[in-house]
């Protein structure tokens, strides 16, 4: 996938919705300039493409939703990269511009004559993309043309600012909420000294900023904070790991507001450097419960505690997806490439036959083998349904008593659609209520996951708690098995009786040395010794002074 030719998935309809999915991995550092994307992705890519196609089929066959109106789509590949996504968004815009200048499908030619060439329908809204940094770039473009955008996993706090991102909405909460959840976990286990890592880019930077601000208010110290690009090379990850080890054994917990591939880079570096088990990673929802993050590096990931957006599997999607085959699936232009990549075999005689694989794909292959549904599938589907319900409400108010697209709705006005979308309220795919606040955000509900060794060489994610609108619930016994196993991540131990904390210049408030007060001094506060006044002496617990009882000497008294 280079910049010369970009594949697009089309589905015809009366109204066309655009979508941006990371069908391929982002370009590696050396390929960024030519915008050459990486390998095809299943969960974040192919599954989301198929979710869009199948969800639209379901919507179109639902007589109560947009009756007499067919929804279609145009799906493009963002490659989880801003430059690629912008290039693709410009294609969406170009369709809209051409469409708005034509009359009844007739395009006016330069010489003044008319042509019967029918151009593509305009995109009324866009679903995605997944990454916050990419979503921001795309929004900057879309809002110029009043095209609403509904995201399914872009959680950056910055996107809540409606003065900057007016046409942006999301079916997921802002990262401010998971930053809070992460701080609540750190507080729960009395970890007062932690290292911090984040992925360079909006998601990681704004999330980590919130985590650090909230930590400071709770008396949690950050040993050091580091940032790294998701597609950084091995050397960068090695250097980062060495820096993290310099804070051991005090800062054993590493809070990682990171994209999944950043976490994988860390795990790989842990393997190279022999650091398995030295850290406990506390990961944001970029990691969640993804197997593509931990595969092959489970020993390094063991013990990790992660935040996952609450989103149960969607059964009807699996029923559809697992039956797909390359012989019959022609509407997904990336499917053959994916099939060959997934099974490491060649589809002989197919248009996209890949000769790099020696083995020929046999007909018994099935997607049921090692199937894992995309953890954000529910959100992807809810985003598509949000667009449909927004259009439905708009049709109801603009075309009362009319089934189908009335003249008042043609062409679709992005401002009116946005208004309608913001008022949307429906039951989502998992039975939860989908609604948007004044910032276009959805409420925050998270699951807390723990990556554990379940048996010999068998590892899995276990649900060990939840965080729902400010309330953290954790099954401590499931995480630690015994209280004595709870990892310590503190800079200094509490001082003993009669000692005060001395914080060295330039050190954080969590790091101190303990110094005993002098013989005639008591502990005034945790940082100060005070001398008792003449005639008094420190109490036994060294927290104050008692008057020394006056003893009068008599002639007959023995020497003291």
């Amino acid at each position: 996938q280079s910049s010369e030719r970009r594949v697009v998935a089309h589905m015809p309809g009366d109204i066309i919705i655009g979508a941006l999915f990371s069908v391929h991995h982002q370009p590696t550092v050396d390929k960024v300039h030519e915008r050459k994307c990486g390998a095809v992705r299943e969960q974040y890519g192919i599954q989301r493409v198929e979710a869009m196609l199948h969800t639209l089929e379901r919507i179109n066959s639902d007589p109560t939703l947009l009756p007499n109106i067919t929804l279609g789509c145009e799906i493009r590949d963002s490659c989880w990269h801003s430059a690629v996504a912008l290039e693709q968004s410009i294609e969406f815009i170009r369709d809209s511009l051409i469409s708005s200048e034509e009359e009844e499908g007739l395009v006016r030619c330069v010489d003044g004559s008319s042509s019967s060439f029918r151009s593509k329908k305009p995109i009324v809204g866009v679903i995605g993309p997944g990454s916050s940094s990419v979503a921001i770039q795309v929004q900057n473009l879309l809002q110029l043309f009043n095209i609403p955008q509904i995201a399914y996993s872009a959680t950056s706090m910055d996107l809540s600012d409606k003065t900057l991102f007016k046409y942006f909405m999301r079916v997921v909460p802002s990262d401010a909420q998971q930053a809070r959840a992460m701080v609540d976990i750190v507080k729960r286990y009395n970890w007062t000294y932690v290292s911090a890592v984040h992925t360079e880019g909006n998601y990681g930077e704004s999330g980590m900023e919130a985590f650090k601000d909230m930590s400071a208010k709770e008396g949690i110290c950050i040993a050091h904070s580091y940032k790294i690009y998701s597609n950084a090379g091995e050397q960068s990850f090695d250097k980062l790991l060495k820096k993290l080890t310099s804070h051991l054994p005090k800062a054993r917990v590493v809070a990682c507001f990171c994209e999944g591939m950043t976490v994988r880079g860390l795990l790989m570096a842990m393997r190279r450097l022999g650091l398995a088990g030295e850290f406990l990673l506390l990961g944001s929802d970029g990691w969640a419960d993804r197997y593509d993050v931990t595969d092959g590096y489970q020993r390094e990931a063991v013990g990790g505690i992660t935040i996952k957006l609450q989103s149960p599997d969607v059964k009807w999607f699996d029923d559809y997806y697992l039956k797909l085959r390359p012989e019959t699936n022609h509407r997904n232009p990336w499917f053959q490439e994916f099939w060959q990549h997934r099974f490491q075999c060649r589809l002989e005689g197919f248009p996209q036959e890949n000769s790099k694989y020696n083995k020929t794909c046999n007909s018994s292959l099935t997607l049921k083998t090692h199937h894992v549904q995309d953890s954000k599938m529910g959100f992807v589907i809810n985003a598509i349904y949000s667009m449909a319900y927004g259009l439905h409400n708009m049709q109801m108010s603009l075309c009362p008593g009319y089934a189908g697209l009335c003249d008042a709705m043609k062409p679709i006005d992005g401002r009116k659609l946005l208004e309608s979308l913001m008022k949307t309220n429906f039951t989502g795919v998992s039975g939860d209520t989908i609604l948007f606040d004044e910032n276009g955000d959805s409420p925050g509900r998270y699951e807390i996951m723990n990556f554990k060794e379940m048996g010999k060489d068998y590892f899995d994610y276990i649900n060990v708690g939840s965080w729902d609108n400010g309330e953290l619930k954790m099954d401590d016994d499931e995480v630690w098995s015994k209280k004595s196993n709870i990892i310590r991540s503190v800079c200094s131990e509490p001082c003993e009786k009669g000692q005060i904390k001395v914080i060295r210049k330039g050190e954080v408030s969590c790091c101190w040395t303990c110094t005993p007060c002098k013989e005639n001094e008591y502990v005034f506060d945790e940082y100060t010794c005070k001398a008792c006044q003449l005639g008094s002496w420190p109490t036994d617990d060294l927290t104050g002074c008692d008057l020394i009882p006056v003893q009068y000497l008599r002639w007959g008294d023995p020497e003291p």
Partner: antibody, heavy 115, light 110 residues
Framework: SVEESGGRLVTPGTPLTLTCTVS????????MGWVRHVPGKGLEWIGI?????STYYASWAKGRFTISKTSTTVDLKITSPTTEDTATYFC?????????????WGPGTLVTVSS | AYDMTQTPASVSEPVGGTVTIKCQAS??????LSWYQQKPGQPPKLLIY???TLASGVSSRFKGSGSGTEYTLTISDLECDDAAAYYC????????????FGGGTEVVVK
């Protein structure tokens, strides 16, 4: 400071334990390594024990050596010495809690394996 | 593994001269390299860590440089006391201890 002890003349196959006694710092904060110097050859790493208790060995040393620790000592057990294990054995402290540059070093203890 | 190759095996220079010892890693060690001096009958002494940081109490005549896979120790204004064996060591990975030390360089001061 760091000091090794336990080096002596042993016959091949007789297990031998070398002890490294430390003072002035805590083994819960620093990794400790064992390095040997075979006469006429260079320095070679045997293994390391991290502050956390994790151990790593050179591939040739796996199964032949075992490193363990208490609060003030680090032991190196040579399970079944051979004549090739004749060397001066050094114990050294890592700069950090895991593998790193090592300093200070102990004076070394001589192990001679001979029949 | 991060195999360390040290050159030359031995070098002889007069008092006041300069000696350069090279150390090559089989793959990048991201400047995590240390240099040691060992005199007969003594334990090694740390001179430089992280490729160029001088250990405490070490003379500034010892200078370390390099990055990636290529590293150099330079000893200037040679003194008789500098006669010793010098070793480089990769400080990056504890899971790859084989050949973590270079083969050593014998420095003779004439």
């Amino acid at each position: 400071s760091v000091e090794e002890s336990g080096g002596r003349l042993v016959t091949p196959g007789t297990p031998l334990t070398l002890t490294c006694t430390v003072s002035g710092f805590s083994l819960s904060r620093y990794a400790m390594g064992w390095v040997r110097h075979v006469p006429g050859k260079g320095l070679e790493w045997i293994g390391i024990i991290y502050a956390s208790g994790s151990t790593y060995y050179a591939s040739w040393a796996k199964g032949r050596f075992t490193i363990s620790k208490t609060s003030t000592t680090v032991d190196l057990k040579i399970t079944s010495p051979t004549t090739e294990d004749t060397a001066t054995y050094f114990c050294a402290r890592s700069r950090t809690a895991t593998y790193d540059a090592v300093d200070p070093w102990g004076p070394g203890t001589l192990v001679t394996v001979s029949s | 593994a991060y195999d360390m190759t040290q050159t030359p095996a031995s070098v002889s220079e007069p008092v006041g001269g300069t000696v350069t010892i090279k150390c090559q890693a089989s793959q990048s060690i991201s400047s995590y390299l240390s240099w040691y001096q060992q005199k007969p009958g003594q334990p090694p002494k740390l001179l430089i860590y992280e490729a160029s940081t001088l250990a405490s109490g070490v003379s500034s005549r010892f200078k370390g440089s390099g990055s990636g896979t290529e590293y150099t120790l330079t000893i200037s204004d040679l003194e008789c006391d500098d006669a010793a064996a010098y070793y480089c060591q990769q400080d990056l990975s504890g899971s790859n201890l084989d050949n973590s030390f270079g083969g050593g360089t014998e420095v003779v001061v004439k």
